[in-house]
Each structure stands twice: as C-alpha cells, then as structure tokens.
C-alpha cells in the first residue's frame, strides 16, 4: 500500500524537515527558517513556537521538531507543553486569584505551586501522628496507637517525603 501510495502521491516521499512544494512541481523543499515538519509527506511546514516574555527556550526549534518552552525563575508551567506560566508562591502558601496566601491552620503546601491541602487525619487510617504538621509539611503517620503500647519497639520517624510535583514535559 505504501509503495502504491508513493507512486500516486510524490509528496509521500518528502521526509520530515521538508515540505512538498506545489509551486516547484511537488519537489521536496527544506522547511524555511523558523519552521519545521515533524512527519513526512507534509504540504506545509509549521511555524516554530517562540518562547518570549515569561517563557524561556528549553529546546531550540529544528527543521524536524518544534521549540519547547519552560518558564523563567519565579514561575512554573501549566498545561500541555507548558502553554502557560504561573507565578510561584512560597512553601506554606497557595496561589489564589488574589495572589499568594498563607495556608490556613490545618493545611499545608510543600510546593511552590498547587493548593494548601488538609493534613492527613492519621486516625482515619488506623494510625497515630508521629510528627505534627506545619504550613509546609503534612503530618507523618506512624503505627496504630495499639502498636505503641509499653514494650513495643520505638519507631524512628521517616524523613518528610516530598510532595508530588513534576517538571514540564
């Protein structure tokens, strides 16, 4: 089928990084500067994304792949492919529509992004509090209260785990 298609459609022979130029008898022309084609058989090249303002270039555009952006310091990516940059807050804060606000008592945020979340209620999972929570850290739950009866071995609190987070894709 691919061979048949290439006989019928000369454009299918144009590799990534080129386009099938109708103005030049359907020969494969390289993508012009600041444009790319990531697949073969394209009739046009796509304009490269430009990382301007609060965006900065993470990966330069090439003839076969678009540029990738991330955010300048003090901001983080939101959306697929870092379509937006959002202001960072401090740990122990969350970004509201009115700006960065401290987490209320009983909630925490150990990231520079995201929301203030309620401390885990250890008792609901049949456990006890080993380390109290703060604005920046969730509580650390330990064994159930019954396991801490006299004679039970002591438990060393684990280091606070880092909250979920990910870098821009």
């Amino acid at each position: 089928f691919e061979r048949t298609r290439s006989l019928q459609d000369p454009c299918s022979n144009c590799p990534a990084g080129t386009f099938c130029d109708n103005n030049r008898n359907q020969i494969c022309s390289p993508c012009p500067p600041n444009s790319f084609s990531s697949a073969g058989g394209q009739r046009t090249c796509d304009i490269c994304r430009q990382c301007k303002g609060v965006f900065r270039t993470r990966k330069e555009c090439s003839s076969t792949s678009n540029a990738e952006c991330d955010c300048t310091p003090g901001f983080h990516c939101l959306g697929a492919g870092c379509s937006m940059c959002e202001q960072d807050c401090k740990q122990g804060q969350e970004l509201t529509k009115k700006g960065c606000k401290d987490c209320c008592f009983g909630t925490f945020n150990d990231q520079k992004r995201g929301i203030c979340r309620p401390w885990t209620n250890c008792s609901l999972d049949g456990k006890s509090v080993l380390v109290n929570g703060t604005k920046e850290r969730d509580v650390v739950c330990g064994p159930s209260p019954a396991d801490l009866s006299p004679g039970a071995s002591s438990v060393t609190p684990p280091a606070p785990a880092r909250e979920p987070g990910h870098s821009p894709q």
Epitope: L95, V139, R162
Partner: antibody, heavy 120, light 106 residues
Framework: QMQLVQSGAEVKKPGASVKVSCKAS????????MHWVRQAPGQGLEWMGW????????NYAQKFQGRVTITRDTSASTAYMELSSLRSEDTAVYYC?????????????WGQGTLVTVSS | SYELTQPPSVSVAPGKTARITCGGN??????VHWYQQKPGQAPVLVIY???DRPSGIPERFSGSNSGNTATLTISRVEAGDEADYYC?????????FGGGTQLTVL
C-alpha cells in the same frame, strides 16, 4: 501511553467490603495525587478522597470517613480504594482519577471505571 | 458545605451555541473545571482553571467564570457533543461536583 487501568467488576453482599485497584502507567506515578470518584446508576459524580502516592497521605470526603480507606503500593504504581460495610446504595461505578497541576484540583486522567454491585 | 447548581438539561440545534451554567456562592473566586461524560464512558476533562483547554479538546469549547456563575460554552455544536457535562471546584478540603447537565443535540 499514559493510562489508569482498574480492576474488574465486583458483586458483594450487604455488610461486606470491596477493594478496587487502579494501576498507573506511562507517567511518573508518585508525582500526581490519585483521587477516587463514584457514580451511582443514573446519578452524578461523587468525590470520595485522594492519596498522595509519594508520602501516602490521604484526605477523605466527610460522607465516607470511617468506611473508606485509600492505600497505595508504590512499587506496583497502584492505588487501592477499600469501602467497608457495604449497602445497596453503594452500588456504583468507581473511578480512579489523576489530579493534574492546575490551580484548584482538576482531574486530567481517569480510569475506565469499576462497577461494584451490592445485592443480597 | 459548598454547593454547585447546574440545569438538568440543555438542548441545542447542530451548528448553534450551547451554554451550560454552574452556579455557586462567589464561584468567581474559585477555579472551575468542566468534564464531559458520554454514556458508558469515564469523564473527560474539557476545560480547566475556568477557561483553559487540555490538548486535544477542540477550540469550540470555552469557559468563563465570574461572580456567582461559571459557564461552559460550546460553539458550532456537533452531534458528537451530546453528553453529560459536570462542573467541579475545590473548596476547603473537598472536591465538589455539580449535579450535571445533559446536553441534547436536536
């Protein structure tokens, strides 16, 4: 590709417990909170709770506190939701859903759902 | 606890614009997300943070949020848009969903 795959349908007697699993693949599993949401037949969506796959911290909807337990197996990239003391009104499709990273807890990827039927 | 109110149903002719509302006390101060759910399928996020579209969601889907009402707008409605739509917010310590709106394409 990124996906959440849930365990199969269950039929339970009133008073019993059910444990539904949700296996994540194609992304950094510990990097995103996992939520559980249920939907009774012909009804809307009802949030049950979340787990932080990294540290294991949980938060449950008040309605389910004391009956639901959400756990995880980090090595298997799997979250579990156990609901106890089942009653007929717990008959529903149970979904796991990944929380994205926009402000305000959006659920950007969902499992296919697990039908739990509670019947005597 | 916080409540979100949606109309149970909205009907629209193909090619026209559908608007689905989500009411809540001072909802404009919150981030609103919208999900589409077709029969027998899991929900799909179509709008997040009031008005942003995940990749793969057509530009026909848009959102707004101010005062006490958030709105999901679907322009140039197609038969394939027929589904249930849910709004959702985060309030204090819980995820809250609206009751859902059934969109019928006439």
């Amino acid at each position: 590709q990124m996906q959440l795959v849930q365990s199969g349908a269950e039929v339970k007697k009133p008073g019993a417990s059910v444990k539904v699993s949700c296996k994540a693949s194609g992304y950094n599993w510990t990097g995103y909170y996992m939520h559980w949401v249920r939907q009774a037949p012909g009804q809307g969506l009802e949030w049950m709770g979340w787990i932080n796959p990294m540290a294991g911290g949980t938060n449950y909807a008040q309605k389910f506190q004391g009956r639901v337990t959400i756990t995880r197996d980090t090595s298997a990239s799997t979250a579990y939701m156990e609901l106890s003391s089942l009653r007929s009104e717990d008959t529903a499709v149970y979904y796991c859903a990944r929380e994205g990273w926009a402000r305000g807890v959006e659920l950007d990827m969902w499992g296919q759902g697990t039908l739990v039927t509670v019947s005597s | 606890s916080y409540e979100l109110t949606q109309p149970p149903s909205v009907s629209v002719a193909p090619g026209k614009t559908a608007r689905i509302t989500c009411g809540g006390n001072n909802i404009g101060s919150k981030s609103v997300h919208w999900y589409q759910q077709k029969p027998g399928q899991a929900p799909v996020l179509v709008i997040y943070y009031d008005s942003d579209r995940p990749s793969g969601i057509p530009e026909r889907f848009s959102g707004s949020n101010s005062g006490n009402t958030a709105t999901l707008t679907i322009s140039r409605v197609e038969a394939g848009d027929e589904a249930d739509y849910y709004c959702q917010v985060w309030d204090s310590s819980s995820v809250v969903f609206g009751g859902g709106t059934q969109l019928t394409v006439l």
